[in-house]
Interface confidence: low
C-alpha cells in the first residue's frame, strides 16, 4: 500500500539550466527506490543509484518529487523543487502626482524569476529614514509623505530584492522637484462650434489626484491634428481648462489631447485620453443620421502617442500656426498644405 506523506516535503530551489541531484533522504546509494514527480513515475535512466539526476533544468521540472522503497512503496523522502532564476537589478522609479502631499515609488524586475521574491525599500531624506507606506492595491508600490516642502535635501530610495537563488539591489537619488509629474487632465471633451466651420471648443478638468491647484497651479499643453495627417499642432496654455481651436479644417475629424505640468517644477504629464470631434459643416454631408452623429460628437479613445517632452516646450517650435506636411505624409516633396488640398487629401 502507498502511504501518504507524513512529513512536510523538503523545499529546494534550483537555477534554471543547471543540473541537480536529489538524494532519496537518508537511503543508501544502492537502495532500490522509485521516484515520482507529481504522482507520475520517472524513468529509471534518470537515477544514479537511489539518487535522481535532473540535467538542464527547465521550468517544467518544478514539482513535488517523491522517492519510495520499490518493494514496500514506503515513502522515504519528498522534495518540492522550484526552478527559477536569481533576480536581476530591479527597475525603480519615483513620482509625485499628488504634489505637495508626497510621492510614490514603484519597482519591478526586468525579467521574471519564477520563484518568490522579497523586496525591501528604504527611503532616506538626507540621513533620515522615511516611512514608505505599502500601497493597499499595488504590491510593488509604496508611498512617502513630505514632512517639509521645498527641501534642498536629496531623497535616496534604495531597493533590494532577494530570493532563494540570489540577491540584487539598486538605488536612485533625486530632488523633491524633479519627480513632480501630474496625472493627465481628465474628461477631455471637444465640441464643434455652431456656424463656425474652423472652430472646436476643447474643455478638460484638472487631474483629480492633484490636491491643491490653487496653491500649485497647473499649466496645460494641447495638441491636435486631423485624423488624415500625422503632424500635430501644439498650444501651450498658462491657465484655464478650456481652449478654442480656431484653425481647424471644416468637415475633418480631429483628435485632441491635453497634458498638464506644475507651473514651475517637474515634468509634463502623459497625454490625456484622446477626444475626437469634427468641426461644424454647412452643407449636408449625405450621411445617415447615425453616421453624422458619430462624426460630430465627441468620443474618446486611448492614445499611444508619447507625452510632451522638454523639446516640445521650445518656444521656437510652438510659434508656427501653419500645417506643415512632410514627404512621409504625402509621398512627395515637403510643402505647405492648403485647406483646398485638405479637402482632396483622403484617408490613407
Amino acid at each position: 500500500q502507498r502511504h501518504s506523506p507524513q512529513e512536510a516535503p523538503h523545499v529546494q530551489y534550483e537555477r534554471l539550466g543547471s543540473d541537480v541531484t536529489l538524494p532519496c533522504g537518508t537511503a543508501n546509494w544502492d537502495a532500490a527506490v522509485t521516484w515520482r514527480v507529481n504522482g507520475t513515475d520517472l524513468a529509471p535512466d534518470l537515477l544514479n543509484g537511489s539518487q535522481l539526476v535532473l540535467r538542464g533544468l527547465e521550468l517544467g521540472h518544478s514539482g513535488l518529487y517523491a522517492c519510495f522503497h520499490r518493494d514496500s512503496w514506503h515513502l522515504r523522502h519528498q522534495v518540492l523543487l522550484h526552478v527559477g532564476l536569481p533576480p536581476r537589478e530591479p527597475v525603480l522609479s519615483c513620482r509625485s502626482n499628488t504634489y505637495p502631499k508626497g510621492f510614490y515609488c514603484s519597482w519591478h524586475l526586468p525579467t521574471p524569476t519564477y520563484i518568490p521574491n522579497t523586496f525591501n525599500v528604504t527611503v532616506l531624506h538626507g540621513s533620515k529614514i522615511m516611512v514608505c507606506e505599502k500601497d493597499p492595491a499595488l504590491k510593488n508600490r509604496c508611498h512617502i509623505r513630505y514632512m517639509h516642502l521645498f527641501s534642498t535635501i536629496k531623497y535616496k530610495v534604495s531597493i533590494s530584492v532577494s530570493n532563494a537563488l540570489g540577491h540584487n539591489a539598486t538605488a536612485i537619488t533625486f530632488d523633491e522637484f524633479t519627480i513632480v509629474k501630474p496625472d493627465p487632465p481628465e474628461n477631455v471633451v471637444a465640441r464643434p462650434v455652431p456656424s463656425n466651420p474652423r472652430r472646436l471648443e476643447v474643455t478638460w478638468q484638472i487631474p483629480s489626484t492633484w490636491p491643491d491647484p490653487e496653491s500649485f497651479p497647473l499649466k496645460f499643453f494641447l495638441r491636435y491634428r486631423p485624423l488624415i495627417l500625422d503632424q500635430w499642432q501644439h498650444v501651450e496654455l498658462s491657465d484655464g481648462t478650456a481652449h478654442t481651436i480656431t484653425d481647424a479644417y471644416a468637415g475633418k475629424e480631429y483628435i485632441i489631447q491635453v497634458a498638464a505640468k506644475d507651473n514651475e517644477i517637474g515634468t509634463w504629464s502623459d497625454w490625456s485620453v484622446a477626444a475626437h470631434a469634427t468641426p461644424w459643416t454647412e452643407e449636408p454631408r449625405h450621411l445617415t443620421t447615425e453616421a453624422q452623429a458619430a462624426e460630430t460628437t465627441t468620443s474618446t479613445t486611448s492614445s499611444l502617442a508619447p507625452p510632451p517632452t522638454t523639446k516640445i516646450c521650445d518656444p521656437g517650435e510652438l510659434g508656427s500656426e501653419q500645417k506643415l506636411i512632410s514627404e512621409e505624409d504625402l509621398g512627395g516633396e515637403q510643402k505647405l498644405i492648403s485647406e483646398e488640398d485638405l479637402h482632396h487629401h483622403h484617408h490613407h
Partner: antibody, heavy 120, light 108 residues
Framework: QVQLVESGGDVVQPGRSLRLSCAAS????????MHWVRQPPGKGLEWVTI????????YYADSVKGRFTISRDNSKNTVFLQMNSLRTEDTGFYYC?????????????WGQGTLVTVSS | DIQMTQSPSSLSASVGDRVTITCRAS??????LNWYQQKPGKAPKLLIY???SLQSGVPSRFSGSGSGTDFTLTISSLQPEDFATYYC??????????FGQGTRLEIK
C-alpha cells in the same frame, strides 16, 4: 520679518488641560514643519513634537505621547499644542519653532516662548 | 534615540579668551549637528549648522568643527555679549530631535 508668537500659557493644576497657540507671520507657513520645544525653569531644551507642513504627520517625544496633541490651521498660519493630563514635570517655557527646509535640518525660526506652570 | 553630551556643563572665562565647548553623540551623526546660543529670558538663536557652517549674521569669532561623534564649538575671542548658554542639537536621526544638556558660559 519673521515672527512666531506663542500664547495660552497659564498656571494649571496637575491633571488639567491647556491649549497653546503659535501664530506665524513673515514666511510661508504652509511650507514648513512646525515644532514645539520646551524648557523647564533653569534647565535645558527638550524637543516635544513636530507636525508636517500639511498636518498629515505628527511625532511626539515619549514623555508626552498620548497626552499632547499637535495640530495646525494653515489658513490661519497657526499651530496648536493641546496638552491634557498635565504633570508637574510639564512645567516650563514652551517655544514653537519652524524647521528649516534646507540641509541639514535645524530650527530656523523661534517664538519668544510662553510659560506653562503645573502646580497644585 | 541618540544622546548628546556636552562638556563642560559650565565654564568661566574672561573677555578676549578663546573658549571651546565640546559635544559628543552616542552614535555617529555625520555632520548633522547644530549649535544654538540662548540668553536668559530669550529664545535660542542658531549659530552653527551642519557642524561647521556659520549662520548668516553670526560673528566670525564663532566656529564649529567635528564629524561623526565628536564636535566642537569655538569662540576665538570672547566678547561681553557672548556670555550665555550654548546647546548642541543633532538632526541625524529624527524624530526625536535631541539636544545636549547645555553649557553655561559665565564671566570670570
Amino acid at each position: 520679518q519673521v515672527q512666531l508668537v506663542e500664547s495660552g500659557g497659564d498656571v494649571v493644576q496637575p491633571g488639567r488641560s491647556l491649549r497653546l497657540s503659535c501664530a506665524a507671520s513673515g514666511f510661508t507657513f504652509s511650507y514648513y514643519g512646525m515644532h514645539w520645544v520646551r524648557q523647564p525653569p533653569g534647565k535645558g531644551l527638550e524637543w516635544v513634537t513636530i507636525i508636517s507642513f500639511d498636518g498629515s504627520q505628527k511625532y511626539y517625544a515619549d514623555s508626552v505621547k498620548g497626552r499632547f496633541t499637535i495640530s495646525r490651521d494653515n489658513s490661519k498660519n497657526t499651530v496648536f499644542l493641546q496638552m491634557n493630563s498635565l504633570r508637574t514635570e510639564d512645567t516650563g517655557f514652551y517655544y514653537c519653532a519652524a524647521q528649516s527646509s534646507t540641509w541639514p535640518e535645524y530650527f530656523q525660526y523661534w517664538g519668544q516662548g510662553t510659560l506653562v506652570t503645573v502646580s497644585s | 534615540d541618540i544622546q548628546m553630551t556636552q562638556s563642560p556643563s559650565s565654564l568661566s572665562a574672561s573677555v578676549g579668551d578663546r573658549v571651546t565647548i565640546t559635544c559628543r553623540a552616542s552614535q555617529s551623526i555625520s555632520s548633522y549637528l547644530n549649535w544654538y546660543q540662548q540668553k536668559p529670558g530669550k529664545a535660542p538663536k542658531l549659530l552653527i549648522y551642519a557642524a561647521s557652517s556659520l549662520q548668516s549674521g553670526v560673528p566670525s569669532r564663532f566656529s564649529g568643527s567635528g564629524s561623526g561623534t565628536d564636535f566642537t564649538l569655538t569662540i576665538s575671542s570672547l566678547q561681553p555679549e557672548d556670555f550665555a548658554t550654548y546647546y548642541c542639537q543633532q538632526s541625524y536621526s529624527t524624530p526625536p530631535i535631541t539636544f545636549g544638556q547645555g553649557t553655561r558660559l559665565e564671566i570670570k
